[in-house]
Interface confidence: medium
């Protein structure tokens, strides 16, 4: 299965910023603006979806204002003239705090999610395909602006409908990548013979050859937590499992379990309250001895995104985080094909699972 390629992100753009939206807006396009509200200067910022760079034709003006208790203005500007404002008297942003702002373009409206929660719907006043530019200005610092093209065969709407009058505000859930150390190594063996992709936010430009079983897909950001899925064929040497997601800002712990029946063959348990990555096996409800050693500092960071790659080899599991090998876990349950269930739970938001 191939996912249509997405535009490359704008990384750490200076504000004020204006950038082209390649191909313009399309139904299903998701645009993520990730940044931090400045704590000092200014009381407003804005994200504009517009035609050209002049600012005279803005299909959607999204304008949080830290004034009068805080509110958000949505509006449209045509030929230099503003229309009637739509105000949301709730402020999901905080000064000095990071945010993750997602705009989903749909046929009738823009749906806006702030830190993973649906915040507002803004119905189109002008045809959205006229939009070819995104601009950001005001009291904000940007980490990135990313673009995710519509995927084929979505299972359900990408944003579940939340009543306008019932906003839910969670702490910010930024997905900005942290600075990486210089290049470590890649790669290993055996082609994946059968791959199932459970995708929420498919990576820009990601492509898969058609697997033997069609991919299961969970549209962004609808991963159910805890997330449980079958590993078709179980584990075997060269089998890899790939997960990516974001640690919640207030996270205490999360876990990734590879299970065999009632046993947990591999329990990977990052603990922020202990600054540790605990590994263990549970057989008949009895835990074995924990393994905690790491070759470097805790790789998971509250509020930041991560990727975990678990590679099964004959004698052990190899685990890499963010492209760097972290540890090996020697098999305690050695009947690999029976290890056929993946369970993920705890204080994370999943964005991609490939089994």
């Amino acid at each position: 299965m191939a996912f249509s390629g997405s535009q490359a992100p704008y990384l750490s753009p200076a504000v004020p910023f204006s950038g082209t939206i390649q191909g313009g807006l399309q139904d299903g396009l998701q645009i993520t603006v990730n940044g931090t509200v400045l704590s000092s200067s200014g009381t407003r910022f804005a994200v504009n979806f517009q035609t050209g760079f002049s600012g005279n034709d803005i299909a959607f003006h999204f304008n949080p204002r830290f004034e009068d208790g805080g509110y958000v203005v949505c509006n449209t500007r045509q030929n230099g003239s503003w229309g009637p404002e739509e105000r949301k008297t709730h402020m999901p942003f905080q000064k000095g705090m990071p945010f993750d702002l997602c705009f989903l373009v749909q046929s009738s409206d823009f749906k806006v999610m702030v830190n993973g929660i649906l915040f507002v719907q803004y119905f189109h006043r002008v045809p959205f395909h006229r939009v070819d530019t995104i601009s950001v200005n005001g009291s904000v610092q940007l980490s990135y602006i990313s673009f995710q093209n519509p995927r084929t065969v979505p299972v359900q709407p990408a944003f579940s409908t939340v009543p306008f009058s019932q906003p839910v505000c969670f702490p910010p859930r930024p997905r900005g990548r942290r600075q990486k150390p210089p290049g470590v190594w890649p790669a290993n063996p055996a082609p994946i013979t059968q791959t199932v992709i459970h995708t929420v936010q498919s990576a820009p430009g990601q492509m898969f050859s058609t697997p033997a079983i069609p991919p299961m897909m969970y549209p962004h950001p609808a991963y159910p937590m805890p997330f449980i899925t079958t590993i078709l064929g179980g584990l075997y040497p060269s089998k890899s499992i790939l997960l990516s997601g974001t640690v919640l800002p207030s996270a205490q712990r999360f876990h990734i379990n590879l299970c065999s029946g009632n046993h947990i063959a591999f329990h990977l348990n990052p603990r922020f309250d202990e600054n540790a990555v605990v590994r263990n096996t549970q057989i008949d409800n009895s835990w074995g001895s924990e393994e905690r050693s790491l070759p470097r500092k805790m790789p998971f960071v509250r509020g930041q995104s991560f990727s975990v790659w678990i590679l099964c080899e004959a004698h052990c599991l190899k685990v890499a985080v963010d492209g760097q090998h972290l540890f090996e876990y020697y098999h305690r349950l050695r009947n690999l094909p029976t290890i056929n269930r993946l369970e993920v739970g705890g204080d994370i938001q999943l964005t991609h699972v490939q089994t």
Partner: antibody
Framework: EVQLVESGGGLVQPGGSLRLSCAAS????????IHWVRQAPGKGLEWVAG????????SYADSVKGRFTISADTSKNTAYLQMNSLRAEDTAVYYC????????????WGQGTLVTVSS | DIQMTQSPSSLSASVGDRVTITCRAS??????VAWYQQKPGKAPKLLIY???SLYSGVPSRFSGSRSGTDFTLTISSLQPEDFATYYC?????????FGQGTKVEIK
């Protein structure tokens, strides 16, 4: 099916520049390392550079450091090797190859593109 | 840089022969060694990784082993399609290096 296709090779004068492309398909591009390996005519293999698109890691052989730049465009599933200040000894077939997991095992290779540096 | 010294540089053998190629790393590389086969005008193909793990789809007559910093590729019974050049590679550090290659020719 995993495929890597190189392009951009050709004849260039010493001191000149060339940009090679490696178009990838059949896998989740951003989660795999992509490497460039070269082979001078009648010689052995020499690893040149590698990149991990998801994290932006890059790594270079000492022989090309400062002259070559590896990059990746995840929107196009393509890796690039920008080669500047080319020398006669850079003449080779350049292969791009996919790394798997986080080790330097190169499990899929392209067909190669020939770069000739000559006046 | 870690050097990989491969020997012999070439060898002549007959179909059915047992062939052994060795590589010595200039320092410890753990088991982070792979072996590749390359035929003229073609890209290399992965045979062995992690010193001794057989890559998917590679015939079982190929095997790899490790003894300290010495690594060995063995072809238990040489077949006509095995005449090629073989390379070892270490990937222990952030920079990979290959051995010089061993050309296996028909006797």
């Amino acid at each position: 099916e995993v495929q890597l296709v190189e392009s951009g090779g050709g004849l260039v004068q010493p001191g000149g520049s060339l940009r090679l492309s490696c178009a990838a398909s059949g896998f989740t591009f951003r989660y795999y390392y992509i490497h460039w390996v070269r082979q001078a005519p009648g010689k052995g293999l020499e690893w040149v550079a590698g990149i991990y698109p998801y994290g932006g890691y890059t790594s270079y052989a000492d022989s090309v450091k400062g002259r070559f730049t590896i990059s990746a465009d995840t929107s196009k599933n393509t890796a690039y090797l920008q080669m500047n200040s080319l020398r006669a000894e850079d003449t080779a077939v350049y292969y791009c190859a996919r790394g798997y997991y986080v080790e330097g095992v190169l499990d899929y290779w392209g067909q190669g593109t020939l770069v000739t540096v000559s006046s | 840089d870690i050097q990989m010294t491969q020997s012999p540089s070439s060898l002549s053998a007959s179909v059915g022969d047992r062939v052994t190629i060795t590589c010595r790393a200039s320092q410890s590389v753990s088991s982070a060694v792979a072996w590749y086969q390359q035929k003229p005008g073609k890209a290399p193909k992965l045979l062995i990784y992690s010193a001794s793990s057989l890559y998917s789809g590679v015939p079982s007559r190929f095997s790899g082993s490790r003894s300290g910093t010495d690594f060995t590729l063995t072809i238990s019974s040489l077949q006509p399609e095995d005449f090629a050049t073989y390379y070892c590679q270490q990937y222990y550090g952030s920079l990979a290096t290959f051995g010089q290659g061993t050309k296996v020719e028909i006797k």
